[in-house]
Protein backbone atom coordinates (compact mmCIF):
# COMPACT_ATOMS: atom_id res chain seq x y z
CA UNK A 1 0.00 0.00 0.00
CA UNK A 2 1.58 3.17 -0.91
CA UNK A 3 1.26 7.13 -0.50
CA UNK A 4 -2.13 8.15 -1.10
CA UNK A 5 -3.10 11.35 -3.47
CA UNK A 6 -4.27 13.35 -1.13
CA UNK A 7 -6.55 16.25 -2.56
CA UNK A 8 -6.40 19.20 -0.10
CA UNK A 9 -8.65 21.78 0.83
CA UNK A 10 -7.33 24.19 -2.19
CA UNK A 11 -8.34 21.20 -4.58
CA UNK A 12 -4.67 20.75 -5.68
CA UNK A 13 -3.76 17.45 -6.36
CA UNK A 14 -0.66 16.26 -4.08
CA UNK A 15 0.87 12.90 -5.35
CA UNK A 16 2.23 11.65 -2.91
CA UNK A 17 4.82 8.81 -2.98
CA UNK A 18 4.03 5.52 -4.10
CA UNK A 19 0.80 6.38 -5.59
CA UNK A 20 0.09 8.09 -9.23
CA UNK A 21 -2.72 9.70 -9.47
CA UNK A 22 -4.36 10.60 -12.61
CA UNK A 23 -4.39 14.20 -13.90
CA UNK A 24 -6.83 16.63 -12.63
CA UNK A 25 -9.67 17.06 -15.14
CA UNK A 26 -9.31 20.67 -15.33
CA UNK A 27 -6.63 22.83 -13.96
CA UNK A 28 -8.69 25.46 -11.81
CA UNK A 29 -6.77 27.69 -9.07
CA UNK A 30 -3.18 26.56 -10.63
CA UNK A 31 -1.35 28.88 -12.77
CA UNK A 32 -0.49 26.99 -15.65
CA UNK A 33 2.58 27.75 -17.85
CA UNK A 34 0.31 26.97 -21.02
CA UNK A 35 3.43 25.07 -22.52
CA UNK A 36 2.62 21.94 -24.52
CA UNK A 37 5.12 19.44 -25.39
CA UNK A 38 5.14 16.21 -27.00
CA UNK A 39 7.13 14.34 -24.87
CA UNK A 40 10.34 14.32 -27.50
CA UNK A 41 8.46 11.62 -29.92
CA UNK A 42 8.58 12.35 -33.46
CA UNK A 43 5.55 13.39 -35.76
CA UNK A 44 5.32 10.56 -38.28
CA UNK A 45 2.09 9.64 -40.89
CA UNK A 46 -1.22 11.02 -39.38
CA UNK A 47 -3.35 8.93 -40.02
CA UNK A 48 -1.78 5.68 -40.22
CA UNK A 49 -0.06 5.18 -37.06
CA UNK A 50 0.09 1.84 -35.30
CA UNK A 51 2.81 2.16 -32.68
CA UNK A 52 2.08 4.15 -29.58
CA UNK A 53 5.85 6.02 -30.04
CA UNK A 54 3.75 7.67 -33.03
CA UNK A 55 1.48 9.26 -31.26
CA UNK A 56 1.79 12.15 -28.48
CA UNK A 57 0.11 14.17 -26.03
CA UNK A 58 0.52 17.30 -24.19
CA UNK A 59 2.26 17.79 -20.90
CA UNK A 60 1.41 21.33 -19.45
CA UNK A 61 3.35 22.74 -16.57
CA UNK A 62 2.08 23.84 -13.68
CA UNK A 63 2.92 25.17 -10.26
CA UNK A 64 1.30 24.78 -6.49
CA UNK A 65 2.12 24.90 -3.17
CA UNK A 66 2.08 21.40 -0.94
CA UNK A 67 0.12 21.45 1.68
CA UNK A 68 0.77 19.22 4.90
CA UNK A 69 -2.09 19.74 7.61
CA UNK A 70 -1.56 23.17 8.69
CA UNK A 71 1.57 23.69 6.57
CA UNK A 72 2.35 24.65 3.62
CA UNK A 73 5.71 24.97 1.01
CA UNK A 74 7.49 27.95 1.40
CA UNK A 75 8.01 27.90 -2.35
CA UNK A 76 5.44 26.47 -5.27
CA UNK A 77 6.92 23.49 -7.08
CA UNK A 78 6.40 23.09 -10.67
CA UNK A 79 5.30 19.84 -11.85
CA UNK A 80 3.29 18.15 -15.03
CA UNK A 81 0.06 17.50 -15.86
CA UNK A 82 -0.69 14.80 -18.39
CA UNK A 83 -3.39 16.25 -20.58
CA UNK A 84 -6.08 15.27 -23.35
CA UNK A 85 -6.46 12.61 -25.80
CA UNK A 86 -2.77 10.94 -27.52
CA UNK A 87 -2.76 11.28 -31.14
CA UNK A 88 -0.76 11.96 -34.22
CA UNK A 89 2.01 14.35 -32.86
CA UNK A 90 1.89 16.13 -35.86
CA UNK A 91 -1.84 16.52 -35.48
CA UNK A 92 -1.52 17.88 -31.57
CA UNK A 93 -1.69 21.52 -31.08
CA UNK A 94 0.77 23.59 -30.18
CA UNK A 95 -0.85 25.32 -27.57
CA UNK A 96 -4.23 24.98 -24.97
CA UNK A 97 -7.27 25.82 -27.41
CA UNK A 98 -5.54 26.43 -30.80
CA UNK A 99 -6.24 23.43 -33.37
CA UNK A 100 -8.05 20.71 -33.26
CA UNK A 101 -8.05 17.36 -31.58
CA UNK A 102 -7.58 14.37 -33.45
CA UNK A 103 -10.19 11.77 -32.40
CA UNK A 104 -9.14 7.83 -33.04
CA UNK A 105 -11.28 5.53 -34.22
CA UNK A 106 -9.56 2.65 -33.51
CA UNK A 107 -7.78 1.30 -30.11
CA UNK A 108 -7.95 4.40 -27.38
CA UNK A 109 -4.74 6.29 -26.28
CA UNK A 110 -4.00 7.48 -23.15
CA UNK A 111 -2.27 10.28 -21.91
CA UNK A 112 -0.63 9.07 -18.82
CA UNK A 113 2.74 9.86 -17.09
CA UNK A 114 5.57 8.32 -17.44
CA UNK A 115 8.08 8.94 -15.30
CA UNK A 116 7.90 10.75 -11.67
CA UNK A 117 10.73 12.36 -9.61
CA UNK A 118 10.88 12.41 -5.95
CA UNK A 119 11.55 16.84 -4.68
CA UNK A 120 11.97 17.60 -1.09
CA UNK A 121 10.21 20.44 -0.15
CA UNK A 122 10.49 22.92 3.26
CA UNK A 123 6.85 23.20 5.07
CA UNK A 124 6.08 26.06 7.33
CA UNK A 125 3.52 26.19 9.74
CA UNK A 126 1.12 28.45 11.41
CA UNK A 127 1.53 29.17 15.43
CA UNK A 128 5.67 29.42 15.43
CA UNK A 129 5.81 26.00 13.96
CA UNK A 130 9.11 25.80 12.79
CA UNK A 131 9.58 23.87 9.18
CA UNK A 132 9.35 20.52 8.47
CA UNK A 133 10.80 17.95 5.49
CA UNK A 134 8.61 16.53 3.20
CA UNK A 135 9.03 14.78 0.33
CA UNK A 136 6.38 14.62 -3.00
CA UNK A 137 6.39 12.84 -5.80
CA UNK A 138 5.96 15.00 -8.93
CA UNK A 139 5.11 13.72 -12.55
CA UNK A 140 8.66 14.39 -14.97
CA UNK A 141 7.00 13.72 -18.28
CA UNK A 142 3.95 11.77 -19.77
CA UNK A 143 3.19 9.49 -22.69
CA UNK A 144 0.43 7.82 -25.01
CA UNK A 145 -0.85 4.07 -23.40
CA UNK A 146 -2.84 1.87 -25.99
CA UNK A 147 -5.29 0.96 -23.85
CA UNK A 148 -7.70 -2.91 -24.28
CA UNK A 149 -10.62 -3.88 -22.88
CA UNK A 150 -8.13 -5.73 -20.41
CA UNK A 151 -6.50 -2.37 -19.01
CA UNK A 152 -7.45 -1.46 -15.44
CA UNK A 153 -6.26 1.80 -13.82
CA UNK A 154 -3.97 0.01 -12.06
CA UNK A 155 -1.94 -0.72 -14.87
CA UNK A 156 -2.29 2.78 -16.00
CA UNK A 157 0.08 3.79 -13.17
CA UNK A 158 3.53 2.81 -14.20
CA UNK A 159 6.50 3.00 -11.84
CA UNK A 160 8.78 5.98 -12.59
CA UNK A 161 11.89 4.22 -11.51
CA UNK A 162 14.18 6.05 -13.64
CA UNK A 163 12.72 9.43 -12.14
CA UNK A 164 14.79 12.10 -12.19
CA UNK A 165 17.24 12.58 -8.96
CA UNK A 166 16.86 16.29 -7.30
CA UNK A 167 19.82 17.87 -7.07
CA UNK A 168 22.94 16.44 -5.43
CA UNK A 169 24.22 19.13 -3.62
CA UNK A 170 22.98 19.12 0.32
CA UNK A 171 20.10 20.90 1.16
CA UNK A 172 19.66 22.94 4.65
CA UNK A 173 18.29 20.34 7.17
CA UNK A 174 15.29 20.94 9.04
CA UNK A 175 17.17 21.87 12.68
CA UNK A 176 15.34 20.94 15.45
CA UNK A 177 14.01 23.82 17.62
CA UNK A 178 14.82 23.35 21.22
CA UNK A 179 11.90 22.56 23.98
CA UNK A 180 11.79 26.77 23.89
CA UNK A 181 12.32 26.94 20.42
CA UNK A 182 10.10 24.69 18.68
CA UNK A 183 10.98 23.25 15.24
CA UNK A 184 9.36 19.72 13.94
CA UNK A 185 7.38 17.77 12.23
CA UNK A 186 4.81 15.15 11.36
CA UNK A 187 2.27 13.22 8.38
CA UNK A 188 0.50 10.30 7.16
CA UNK A 189 -0.58 5.79 8.31
CA UNK A 190 -1.49 2.25 8.51
CA UNK B 1 2.84 -3.02 -1.90
CA UNK B 2 5.45 -1.20 0.05
CA UNK B 3 7.71 -3.30 1.96
CA UNK B 4 10.53 -3.24 4.42
CA UNK B 5 12.92 -6.45 5.44
CA UNK B 6 15.02 -6.23 8.05
CA UNK B 7 18.35 -8.15 8.83
CA UNK B 8 18.49 -11.22 11.39
CA UNK B 9 18.44 -11.13 15.40
CA UNK B 10 22.36 -10.54 16.39
CA UNK B 11 23.99 -10.93 20.07
CA UNK B 12 26.66 -9.00 21.14
CA UNK B 13 29.14 -8.22 23.52
CA UNK B 14 29.39 -4.98 25.60
CA UNK B 15 31.23 -2.18 23.86
CA UNK B 16 30.99 -3.74 20.21
CA UNK B 17 28.75 -2.27 17.58
CA UNK B 18 25.68 -3.63 15.10
CA UNK B 19 24.86 -3.06 11.79
CA UNK B 20 20.97 -3.45 11.40
CA UNK B 21 20.14 -3.75 7.53
CA UNK B 22 16.70 -2.68 5.47
CA UNK B 23 15.69 -3.70 2.40
CA UNK B 24 13.12 -1.38 0.95
CA UNK B 25 10.93 -2.15 -1.74
CA UNK B 26 8.04 -0.93 -3.35
CA UNK B 27 9.48 2.78 -4.03
CA UNK B 28 12.90 4.05 -3.93
CA UNK B 29 14.54 4.64 -1.08
CA UNK B 30 15.86 7.60 -2.19
CA UNK B 31 12.29 9.26 -2.60
CA UNK B 32 11.75 8.65 1.47
CA UNK B 33 12.83 9.45 4.48
CA UNK B 34 14.37 6.53 6.49
CA UNK B 35 13.53 6.28 10.39
CA UNK B 36 14.88 3.81 13.18
CA UNK B 37 12.79 3.25 16.21
CA UNK B 38 13.72 1.09 19.00
CA UNK B 39 12.02 -0.68 21.65
CA UNK B 40 13.14 -2.31 24.86
CA UNK B 41 11.53 -5.42 25.89
CA UNK B 42 8.35 -4.37 27.62
CA UNK B 43 9.06 -0.75 26.71
CA UNK B 44 7.34 1.79 25.27
CA UNK B 45 9.17 3.49 21.42
CA UNK B 46 12.31 5.44 20.98
CA UNK B 47 13.24 7.74 18.16
CA UNK B 48 17.00 7.21 17.35
CA UNK B 49 17.33 9.49 14.39
CA UNK B 50 15.95 10.13 10.56
CA UNK B 51 18.30 10.35 7.08
CA UNK B 52 17.42 11.40 3.66
CA UNK B 53 18.71 8.87 1.12
CA UNK B 54 18.86 11.06 -1.49
CA UNK B 55 21.52 13.70 -0.52
CA UNK B 56 22.89 11.95 3.04
CA UNK B 57 20.88 14.40 5.41
CA UNK B 58 20.83 13.23 8.62
CA UNK B 59 18.87 13.67 12.19
CA UNK B 60 19.94 11.87 15.17
CA UNK B 61 18.40 11.93 18.84
CA UNK B 62 20.77 13.52 20.86
CA UNK B 63 20.91 10.89 23.15
CA UNK B 64 22.16 8.73 20.57
CA UNK B 65 24.55 11.18 18.76
CA UNK B 66 28.17 9.70 18.39
CA UNK B 67 26.82 6.16 18.97
CA UNK B 68 25.06 5.69 15.79
CA UNK B 69 25.00 6.23 12.14
CA UNK B 70 22.44 6.27 10.02
CA UNK B 71 23.13 5.02 6.18
CA UNK B 72 21.67 3.98 2.58
CA UNK B 73 22.93 2.25 -0.15
CA UNK B 74 20.65 3.74 -3.29
CA UNK B 75 21.49 1.39 -5.80
CA UNK B 76 20.04 -1.91 -3.38
CA UNK B 77 17.59 0.38 -1.81
CA UNK B 78 18.48 -0.64 1.46
CA UNK B 79 19.26 1.37 4.47
CA UNK B 80 21.64 0.50 7.76
CA UNK B 81 21.31 1.51 10.94
CA UNK B 82 25.24 0.90 13.13
CA UNK B 83 25.25 1.30 17.01
CA UNK B 84 28.50 1.38 18.82
CA UNK B 85 29.83 1.08 22.39
CA UNK B 86 26.75 -1.34 23.22
CA UNK B 87 25.65 -1.78 26.44
CA UNK B 88 23.24 -3.48 27.99
CA UNK B 89 20.66 -1.09 28.26
CA UNK B 90 20.73 -1.58 24.37
CA UNK B 91 19.10 -4.35 23.95
CA UNK B 92 16.16 -3.91 21.87
CA UNK B 93 13.91 -4.46 18.79
CA UNK B 94 15.19 -2.31 16.43
CA UNK B 95 12.69 -1.14 13.36
CA UNK B 96 13.56 0.63 10.15
CA UNK B 97 10.17 2.51 9.00
CA UNK B 98 10.01 5.03 6.22
CA UNK B 99 7.99 7.63 4.93
CA UNK B 100 7.56 10.94 2.98
CA UNK B 101 8.25 13.22 5.72
CA UNK B 102 10.57 13.49 8.25
CA UNK B 103 8.55 13.57 11.49
CA UNK B 104 6.43 10.61 11.31
CA UNK B 105 7.04 6.74 10.71
CA UNK B 106 4.35 5.26 6.90
CA UNK B 107 5.36 1.78 7.08
CA UNK B 108 7.92 -0.22 9.69
CA UNK B 109 10.09 -3.17 9.30
CA UNK B 110 9.29 -6.27 11.00
CA UNK B 111 12.46 -5.72 13.38
CA UNK B 112 15.84 -7.04 14.49
CA UNK B 113 16.46 -8.05 17.92
CA UNK B 114 19.33 -7.31 19.22
CA UNK B 115 20.58 -8.73 22.25
CA UNK B 116 23.68 -6.63 24.83
CA UNK B 117 25.47 -9.21 26.94
CA UNK B 118 28.85 -10.11 28.14
CA UNK C 1 12.92 16.20 25.57
CA UNK C 2 8.55 16.49 25.17
CA UNK C 3 7.11 14.05 27.81
CA UNK C 4 4.09 12.30 26.11
CA UNK C 5 2.01 11.03 28.96
CA UNK C 6 -0.65 8.43 27.67
CA UNK C 7 -3.48 7.41 30.11
CA UNK C 8 -4.96 4.79 30.79
CA UNK C 9 -1.66 2.39 30.69
CA UNK C 10 -4.00 -0.33 30.24
CA UNK C 11 -7.82 -0.69 29.74
CA UNK C 12 -10.46 -3.78 29.30
CA UNK C 13 -13.09 -3.69 26.87
CA UNK C 14 -15.55 -5.35 25.15
CA UNK C 15 -16.14 -6.26 21.37
CA UNK C 16 -18.55 -2.98 20.61
CA UNK C 17 -17.86 -0.68 23.04
CA UNK C 18 -16.66 2.70 22.34
CA UNK C 19 -13.00 3.09 23.61
CA UNK C 20 -11.19 6.61 24.24
CA UNK C 21 -7.41 6.49 24.91
CA UNK C 22 -5.72 10.35 25.90
CA UNK C 23 -2.51 11.81 25.81
CA UNK C 24 -1.15 14.74 27.52
CA UNK C 25 2.04 16.40 26.09
CA UNK C 26 4.28 18.17 28.40
CA UNK C 27 3.91 21.87 26.34
CA UNK C 28 3.00 22.78 23.19
CA UNK C 29 2.83 20.76 20.15
CA UNK C 30 0.50 21.74 18.12
CA UNK C 31 -1.58 19.22 15.81
CA UNK C 32 1.58 17.25 15.42
CA UNK C 33 0.25 14.30 16.67
CA UNK C 34 0.51 10.51 15.59
CA UNK C 35 -0.67 7.56 16.78
CA UNK C 36 0.20 4.29 16.01
CA UNK C 37 -1.53 0.50 16.82
CA UNK C 38 1.13 -2.35 17.81
CA UNK C 39 0.59 -6.43 18.16
CA UNK C 40 2.48 -8.36 19.93
CA UNK C 41 5.34 -9.35 18.04
CA UNK C 42 4.76 -7.29 15.54
CA UNK C 43 6.06 -3.70 14.19
CA UNK C 44 4.01 -0.45 14.82
CA UNK C 45 0.93 0.39 12.26
CA UNK C 46 0.30 4.07 11.79
CA UNK C 47 -3.49 5.34 12.34
CA UNK C 48 -3.59 9.27 12.44
CA UNK C 49 -1.64 11.84 11.87
CA UNK C 50 -1.87 15.64 12.48
CA UNK C 51 -3.86 14.58 15.61
CA UNK C 52 -7.12 13.60 13.64
CA UNK C 53 -6.30 12.67 9.86
CA UNK C 54 -6.84 8.91 9.25
CA UNK C 55 -4.23 7.48 7.24
CA UNK C 56 -4.51 5.13 4.03
CA UNK C 57 -7.20 1.86 4.73
CA UNK C 58 -7.47 2.61 8.76
CA UNK C 59 -10.83 2.05 9.40
CA UNK C 60 -13.41 4.87 9.77
CA UNK C 61 -14.09 3.62 13.56
CA UNK C 62 -10.76 5.24 14.65
CA UNK C 63 -10.35 8.62 15.15
CA UNK C 64 -8.10 11.50 16.41
CA UNK C 65 -8.54 14.54 18.14
CA UNK C 66 -7.02 17.84 19.86
CA UNK C 67 -4.51 20.63 19.19
CA UNK C 68 -1.54 22.27 22.00
CA UNK C 69 -0.86 19.54 24.59
CA UNK C 70 -4.16 17.23 24.89
CA UNK C 71 -5.23 14.57 22.22
CA UNK C 72 -6.94 11.79 22.39
CA UNK C 73 -8.08 8.45 20.06
CA UNK C 74 -11.42 7.35 20.32
CA UNK C 75 -12.57 3.60 18.74
CA UNK C 76 -16.34 3.63 18.56
CA UNK C 77 -17.01 0.33 18.55
CA UNK C 78 -14.31 -1.80 19.38
CA UNK C 79 -13.48 -4.95 16.80
CA UNK C 80 -11.56 -7.94 17.72
CA UNK C 81 -8.76 -7.53 15.77
CA UNK C 82 -8.39 -4.00 17.38
CA UNK C 83 -7.23 -6.02 20.90
CA UNK C 84 -3.62 -4.11 20.93
CA UNK C 85 -1.26 -1.36 22.48
CA UNK C 86 -1.55 1.92 21.27
CA UNK C 87 0.74 4.76 21.68
CA UNK C 88 0.82 8.73 20.78
CA UNK C 89 3.85 10.25 19.52
CA UNK C 90 4.96 13.64 18.91
CA UNK C 91 6.56 15.07 15.79
CA UNK C 92 6.66 18.69 16.72
CA UNK C 93 9.90 18.86 18.42
CA UNK C 94 13.17 16.74 17.92
CA UNK C 95 13.46 14.04 19.48
CA UNK C 96 10.42 13.05 18.54
CA UNK C 97 8.60 11.01 21.68
CA UNK C 98 6.32 8.60 21.89
CA UNK C 99 3.72 7.79 24.67
CA UNK C 100 4.37 5.00 26.97
CA UNK C 101 1.58 3.34 25.26
CA UNK C 102 -2.09 2.13 26.55
CA UNK C 103 -3.08 -1.95 26.12
CA UNK C 104 -6.49 -2.12 25.14
CA UNK C 105 -7.21 -5.85 26.40
CA UNK C 106 -10.44 -8.16 26.25
CA UNK C 107 -12.94 -7.99 29.10
Known amino acids: QGWQAFKNDATEIIPELGEYPEPPPELENNKTMNRAENGGRPPHHPFETKDVSEYSCRELHFTRYVTDGPCRSAKPVTELVCSGQCGPARLLPNAIGRGKWWRPSGPDFRCIPDRYRAQRVQLLCPGGEAPRARKVRLVASCKCKRLTRFHNQSELKDFGTEAARPQKGRKPRPRARSAKANQAELENAY | QVQLVQSGAEVKKPGASVKVSCKVSGFPIKDTFQHWVRQAPGKGLEWMGW????????EYASKFQGRVTMTEDTSTDTAYMELSSLRSEDTAVYYCATGDTTYKFDFWGQGTTVTVSS | DIQMTQSPSSLSASVGDRVTITCKAS??????VAWYQQKPGKAPKLLIYWASTRWTGVPSRFSGSGSGTDFTLTISSLQPEDFATYYC?????????FGGGTKVEIK
Open chain 2, 51 to 58: SDPEIGDT
Open chain 3, 89 to 97: QQGDTLPYT
Open chain 3, 27 to 32: QDVHTA
